[in-house]
């Protein structure tokens, strides 16, 4: 049965030509957490896997970083980057877990973290 | 339990535009995830065509982009697909599917084969 | 695009026995292979996801192995309703792509 649930930094914004980090947790499971993929709808971004380590994918290797953690940092943000960014933590026993972020990039200097909020 | 069933004719002449449509129940579309189209010629492997996301946002197979059309009626819980310009080798089995974020395929519908011949 | 090469196009074998079937890539996908299972007239059932990660309820028979262009496929002791075409997919980047199938019948 899965119990746990994800936590993010939810919906986020950030300016243009910045920097900012997607984080999740996994909080309330005991499961073992083996890989952490990073997508976007159409594309994924980077892969944490227990074993192997890091990947990241060639389209992104300039401007993500792995880290801190399972976390990834996207950095020299353009207004495309705008957009939804999915953790999804591949567990044992569990199974998955999805987590979902918002990113909006703002010309401006108006940017500043939403709320946080949890997906079961 | 989320089921997709796909509908249309199954015969479309020539040079003419297949049309499908694919009934979603079990789950909102406008919800969350992607909704793909899925084709497979007779004795064939799969080939994927493209998706609407449950925002309304797009993606097509860059081989196929000129002809393809991915639409949604969110009032009846469908999302369609247009195919232009049919020739025999578009003959196939057309599936619906639901796509996990991670860009695999947990849903299918039972498909439905579309014969292109005069 | 990514090719993704499937061998043997077919395997003839028998209840009990052990099958493993492979998949490479034309360019390196880390770990994003799918597994899929499809009986004529059916749609594909997936099986494994993330090249090694059973699907719900999938039976524990089935394993996927593999990271970086080279993917295994494997079922530990083919039962009667094994019997069927396998495809693999990878979901590393658009357009999404399968291998050309395999298909398992009996020996």
């Known amino acids: 049965m899965m119990t746990g649930t994800i936590e993010t930094t939810g919906n986020i914004s950030a300016e243009k030509g910045g920097s900012i980090i997607l984080q999740c947790h996994l909080s309330s499971t005991t499961a073992q957490v083996t890989q952490v993929n990073w997508e976007q709808q159409d594309q994924l971004l980077a892969i944490c896997n227990a074993d192997l380590g890091w990947h990241i994918s060639p389209s992104f290797k300039d401007r993500v970083a792995p880290g801190p953690g399972l976390g990834l940092t996207l950095q020299s943000l353009t207004v495309n980057d705008t957009g939804e960014y999915f953790c999804i933590y591949h567990t044992y026993p569990d199974g998955t877990y999805t987590g979902r972020i918002f990113l909006e990039v703002l010309e401006s200097s108006v940017a500043e973290h939403g709320a946080r909020f949890q997906i079961p | 339990q989320v089921q997709l069933q796909e509908s249309g004719p199954g015969l479309v002449k020539p040079s003419q535009t297949l049309s499908l449509t694919c009934t979603v129940s079990?789950?909102?579309?406008?919800?969350?995830?992607?909704w793909n189209w899925i084709r497979q010629p007779p004795g064939k492997g799969l080939e994927w065509m493209g998706y609407?996301?449950?925002?309304?946002?797009?993606r097509y197979n860059p081989s196929l982009k000129s002809r393809i059309t991915i639409s949604r009626d969110t009032s009846k819980n469908q999302f369609s697909l247009k195919f232009s310009s049919v020739t025999a080798a578009d003959t196939a089995v057309y599936y619906c599917?639901?796509?996990?974020?991670?860009?695999?395929?947990?849903?299918w519908g039972q498909g439905t084969l579309v014969t292109v011949s005069s | 695009d990514i090719q993704m090469t499937q061998s043997p196009s077919s395997l003839s074998t028998s209840v009990g026995d052990r099958v493993t079937i492979t998949c490479k890539a034309s360019?390196?996908?880390?770990?994003?292979v799918a597994w899929y299972q499809q009986k004529p007239g059916k749609a594909p059932k997936l099986l494994i996801y993330?090249?090694?990660y059973r699907y719900t309820g999938v039976p524990s028979r089935f394993s996927g192995s593999g990271s970086g262009t080279d993917f295994t496929f494997t079922i530990s002791s083919v039962q009667p309703e094994d019997f069927a075409t396998y495809y693999c997919?990878?979901?590393?980047?658009?357009?999404?792509?399968f291998g050309q199938g395999t298909r398992l019948e009996i020996k």
């Open positions: 599917s639901r796509k996990y974020y991670g860009s695999w395929f947990p849903y």
């Open positions: 079990g789950y909102s579309i406008t919800s969350d995830y992607a």
């Open positions: 993330s090249a090694s």
């Open positions: 997919q990878q979901h590393y980047s658009t357009p999404w792509t």
């Open positions: 360019q390196d996908v880390f770990t994003a």
């Open positions: 609407i996301s449950y925002s309304g946002n797009t």
